[in-house]
């Protein structure tokens, strides 16, 4: 039961996380104009990964896409790439994890196959979360660097007669959404990996039982069945003897050298 709950919760947390990563990637407010001593501004600038926007006091908002690819800073391209990789990995992870869910029956898919799929999706979620966190952190670092550079050059002009106020940018809402979403995806991935341990068929110590068949005797010794390590393996490990009827979730598992950590 705990395995199913852990797997289900991991899936839901990852789903929320990936939705957040997608939302953050699409959001326009990655960086917003720093209002320092002026909380009300007539012209408010904010920028995303794909376009920059200006909201006037009049209520009019204008957004312009970055129609150039080569003209964009390498760091911005890197952040875009990290976020997209995170989304793609997360989406594939979600697809894999749906089929891996213990509560969903697909043909005669075994626990070993589901365990492998759970582990795969968990790893994908972890990498997806790390990509998002890395992307957002790179962008945040870029903002901090630019912020202090523009603070140093805050006012420029000749003899102080004509002032050019440089627009400074600070952290936008998308950064916080991205960090939280990346964290959730990471947590969801870890939960999936933990659930995988409980799903994997283990080497079980059964008492040796002798069956007397007509003509010859066959003794089944403990340790005869190993959990398959093959990715997506469909090997069926049939138990010869079970010391009592148990529901699927109640079957006890013991750690073995084949556990995925």
């Amino acid at each position: 039961m705990a395995v199913t709950a852990c797997q289900g919760l991991g899936f839901v947390v990852s789903l929320i996380g990936i939705a957040g990563i997608i939302a953050a990637t699409c959001m326009d407010q990655w960086s917003t104009q720093d209002l320092y001593n002026n909380p009300v501004t007539a012209v408010f600038n904010y920028q995303g990964l794909w376009r920059s926007c200006v909201r006037e006091s009049s209520g009019f908002t204008e957004c312009r896409g970055y129609f150039t690819l080569l003209g964009l800073p390498a760091m911005l391209q890197a952040v875009r790439a990290l976020m997209i990789v995170g989304i793609v990995l997360g989406a594939i992870g979600l697809l894999v994890s749906i089929f891996a869910l213990k509560c969903i029956r697909i043909g005669s898919m075994e626990d070993s196959a589901k365990a492998n799929m759970t582990l795969t999706s968990g790893i994908m979620f972890i990498v997806s979360g790390l990509c998002a966190i890395a992307g957002v952190s790179v962008f945040a670092n870029m903002l901090v660097t630019n912020f202090w550079m523009s603070t140093a050059n805050m006012y420029t002009g000749m003899g102080g007669m004509v002032q050019t106020v440089q627009t400074r940018y600070t952290f936008g809402a998308a950064l916080f959404v991205g960090w939280v979403a990346g964290g959730l995806t990471l947590i969801g991935g870890v939960m999936m990996c933990i659930a995988c341990r409980g799903l994997a068929p283990e080497e079980t110590n059964y008492k040796a039982v002798s069956y007397h068949a007509s003509g010859h005797s066959v003794a089944y010794k403990p340790g005869g069945f190993k959990a398959s390590t093959g990715f997506g393996s469909n090997t069926k490990n049939k138990k010869i003897y079970d010391g009592g009827a148990r529901t699927e979730d109640e079957v006890q598992s013991y750690p073995s050298k084949h556990d995925y950590v």
Epitope: A42, V43, N45, C53, E56, F60, E62
Partner: antibody, heavy 118, light 113 residues
Framework: QVQLQESGPGLIKPSQTLSLTCTVS?????????WHWIRQPPGKGLEWIGY???????NYNPALRSRVTISVDTSKNQFSLKLSSVTAADTAIYYC???????????WGQGTTVTVSS | DIVMTQSPDSLAVSLGERATINCKSS????????????LTWYQQKPGQPPKLLIY???TRESGVPDRFSGSGSGTDFTLTISSLQAEDVAVYYC?????????FGGGTKLEIK
């Protein structure tokens, strides 16, 4: 077409509070725009007083902030200006206006002349 | 506050001639976010409220004759009337639309020579 009309007393004594109302017709005051007050002393230039949004959020000219209050009544489609402790320097034509693209003012009231005199 | 300085204070131009009014701001009115200059021009005739002519320094308001044009960037701006008509006699104001408080120039009185 949005139309604005100012109303209020034409003559007021020094130290009193000036109260003006701007009635909006041909459009809703709740349309999302900011509604402004601008004044023009006789023979002089224009001075921005402040604005109000239909939600009640305001922004005032720092030079007048301590004396100005702008309020809105969405049910009557009106917004009002109150200027306390008036002096002869507050004698002007008071305009209400609606902002638009480029933070410009394409819509103005005809203006109401307020004279501060004892 | 941004100080707007207009020149000249008054201008006399013959009918059909070009009229040029200048406006200088104490701070740049250029917004890098949308590459626009937040300067507005108004025309005011006696006994009337100001009439919007140009916003974003060079965008003509609908209904404004094309003889009116705006130019400039940063801190220096110009309003040009390519061929002066009798009805253009008025006072012209520039406005800082970039930051609060909005400020206006002192005005330029345009007359016919």
């Amino acid at each position: 077409q949005v139309q604005l009309q100012e109303s209020g007393p034409g003559l007021i004594k020094p130290s009193q509070t000036l109260s003006l109302t701007c009635t909006v017709s041909g459009g809703s005051i709740s349309s999302g725009y900011n509604w402004h007050w601008i004044r023009q002393p006789p023979g002089k230039g224009l001075e921005w007083i402040g604005y109000i949004h239909y939600t009640g959020s305001t922004n005032y000219n720092p030079a007048l902030r301590s004396r100005v209050t702008i309020s809105v009544d969405t049910s009557k489609n009106q917004f009002s200006l109150k200027l306390s402790s008036v002096t002869a320097a507050d004698t002007a034509i008071y305009y209400c206006a609606r902002i638009y693209n480029g933070n410009s003012f394409p819509y103005w009231g005809q203006g109401t002349t307020v004279t501060v005199s004892s | 506050d941004i100080v707007m300085t207009q020149s000249p204070d008054s201008l006399a131009v013959s009918l059909g001639e070009r009229a040029t009014i200048n406006c200088k701001s104490s701070q740049s009115l250029f917004n890098s976010g949308n590459q626009k200059n937040y300067l507005t021009w108004y025309q005011q005739k006696p006994g009337q409220p100001p009439k919007l002519l140009i916003y974003w320094a060079s965008t003509r308001e609908s209904g404004v004759p094309d003889r009116f044009s705006g130019s400039g960037s940063g801190t220096d701006f110009t309003l040009t009337i390519s061929s002066l008509q009798a009805e253009d006699v008025a006072v012209y104001y520039c406005q800082n639309a970039y930051s609060f408080p909005y400020t206006f120039g002192g005005g330029t009185k345009l007359e016919i020579k």
